[in-house]
């Protein structure tokens, strides 16, 4: 996944007992957060693995790459990187792998440059509806937002809200529009079973989106049709057993699509003859000739390339008379 | 039914290449990805590599790459590895296996000696 | 790349007796496929997505598992099933690894 990363060279550290010392005052222009590493030079701080409970309150405000992974901040609640000034020049915020189980409304308020967020690997059992839009609006005000990096963050079973977890997240992409500048969306490793219909359509700036690792079963009700810009979309890893027609007329219709298959259990039987077909002509699926069978078993392990109409049979389903049980 | 047919044994020279051979019987020899297995005497099994029989698309492991070359001849329904430069370390069974999530066939081994 | 450790090593069981063996995987993996090999033969698959025994394979043996952790099991250990079994990870693309196999002999 693509998370901010720095160049920097030369970081100043700032001494662990000062940590009691939050200043309410402005921060000087060089002050460096307790347990943090900052170089003003790459504009870049790091506070990693440091087992955080809280935002730092005393960022530089040149920060424009801020690392806050390895840590354990729970909750991030709403205007949890607000400041006086505010952190204008901050453009990308990884926050993975710290524990947070529950992402507020307005949680990313005040930064208006903030254009990669990285939430990964955080078990997010209630991320708000609001979270990436900051308002309850219909409409909200434009999220500066181009990459949003959402890869692993179901959390386990037992800690999940009786809701559905695919609802959760789309909700929180879809609030108030504000997603509209939306570049790259990885959803990777998050048990997905389906992806809601509407979520694609209000997303139409997407240039690669990344769905692999879930246990998608079906694109039936997925539409593709109104992402022209989309470039990459990375299906691997799936339950995915066939593609239908109008998913593929979607996706040959896309002018700069690569799609990725891999490692989807096929079943090649009679529904498979149109994907099949598509597959012999299209240009758009990357290592297309690495797909195969999984099912049935007389099917199994075969090239989906090099299969043909006649090897594509369902068994006939009997009537109810001549059924045995 | 499926077959596929190995050499029993090779014996080469330390630095020589070798090219073994699998050949494919009782099934569409180019619907299915040949893969290639090593066995070290008492050890497991390590993958080296698979081919494509109908366009010859190969994947390597790593660890093979600049060792393991595999092709195949769709007339004789064969395919082949060449293993070049080759040391003691090569001494191994190396099997042929038809597969694609997992390998259903393999064939019985070529038991590769590197002696001088 | 997923890395596969199979437990243990080496074991022995008696005619009659249950026996189970495991294969942990490093990252979560949808399905695990087993091979036996006896001494002096090729790997024949055994068990394929984690439970599903392959044609021929005696109902006494059975898998299961599912993430990281998968194991085989036989019900009532027999002469024929002394060998070395491999666990590999389900995948239809580069590489394909096996884990370090459980020899088991009859005792």
């Known amino acids: 996944s693509s998370s901010p990363t720095s160049s920097a060279s030369s970081f100043s550290s700032s001494a662990p007992f000062l940590a009691s010392a939050v200043s309410a005052q402005p921060p000087l222009p060089d002050q460096c957060p307790a347990l943090c590493e900052c170089s003003e030079a790459a504009r870049t701080v790091k506070c990693v693995n440091r087992n955080l409970t809280e935002v730092p309150t005393d960022l530089p405000a040149y920060v424009r790459n801020l690392f806050l992974t390895g840590n354990q901040l729970a909750v991030l609640p709403a205007g949890a990187f607000a400041r006086r000034p505010p952190l204008a020049e901050l453009a990308a915020l990884n926050l993975s792998g710290s524990r947070l189980d529950e992402v507020r409304a307005g949680a990313f308020e005040h930064l208006p440059s903030l254009r990669q967020l990285d939430l990964s690997h955080n078990p997010l059992a209630d991320l708000s509806p609001f979270a990436f839009s900051g308002s309850n609006a219909s409409v909200s005000a434009p999220s500066p937002l181009v990459e949003l990096i959402l890869n692993h963050i179901v959390p386990p079973e037992d800690e999940r809200q009786n809701r559905s977890f695919e609802g959760m997240v789309v909700a929180a992409l879809l609030a108030g529009r504000a997603l509209q500048g939306l570049r790259r969306l990885e959803l990777a490793s998050n048990h997905f079973l389906y992806l809601p219909r509407d979520v694609l359509a209000q997303l139409p700036s997407l240039r690669h989106l990344d769905l692999s690792n879930n246990s998608l079963v079906s694109l039936t009700y997925v539409s593709f049709r109104n992402l022209t810009h989309l470039e990459s979309l990375h299906l691997e890893d799936n339950a995915l057993k066939v593609l239908h027609n109008g998913t593929l007329a979607e996706l040959q219709g896309l002018p700069h699509i690569r799609v990725f298959l891999d490692n989807n259990p096929w079943v090649c039987d009679c529904h498979m003859a149109d994907m099949v077909t598509w597959l012999k002509e299209t240009e758009v699926v990357q290592g297309k000739d690495r797909l195969t069978c999984a099912y049935p078993e007389k099917m199994r392990n075969r090239v989906l390339l090099e299969l043909n109409s006649a090897d594509l049979d369902c068994d006939p389903i009997l009537p109810p008379s001549l059924q045995t049980s | 039914q499926v077959q596929l047919q190995q050499p029993g044994t090779e014996l080469v020279k330390p630095g020589a290449s070798v090219k073994l051979s699998c050949k494919a019987s009782?099934?569409?020899?180019?619907?299915?990805?040949m893969h290639w297995v090593k066995q070290r005497p008492e050890q497991g099994l390590e993958w080296i590599g698979n081919i494509n029989p109908s366009n010859g698309n190969t994947n390597y492991n790593e660890n093979f790459k600049s060792q393991a070359t595999l092709t195949v001849d769709k007339s004789s329904s064969t395919a082949y590895m060449q293993l070049s430069s080759l040391t003691s370390e090569d001494s191994a069974v190396y099997y042929c296996a038809r597969g694609g999530w997992d390998f259903d066939y393999w064939g019985q081994g070529t038991t590769l000696t590197v002696s001088s | 790349q997923v890395v596969l450790t199979q437990s243990p090593a080496i074991m022995s069981a008696s005619p009659g007796e249950k026996v189970t063996m495991t294969c942990s995987a490093s990252s979560s993996v949808r399905y695990i496929h087993w091979y036996q090999q006896r001494s002096g033969t090729s790997p024949k698959r055994w068990i394929y997505d984690t439970s599903k025994l392959t044609s021929g394979v005696p109902v006494r043996f059975s898998g299961s598992g599912s993430g990281t952790s998968y194991s085989l099991t036989i019900s009532s250990m027999e002469a024929e099933d002394a060998a070395t079994y491999y666990c590999q990870q389900w995948t239809s693309k580069p590489p394909w690894t096996f884990g370090g196999g459980t020899k088991l002999e009859i005792r």
């Open positions: 009782g099934y569409t020899f180019t619907s299915y990805w």
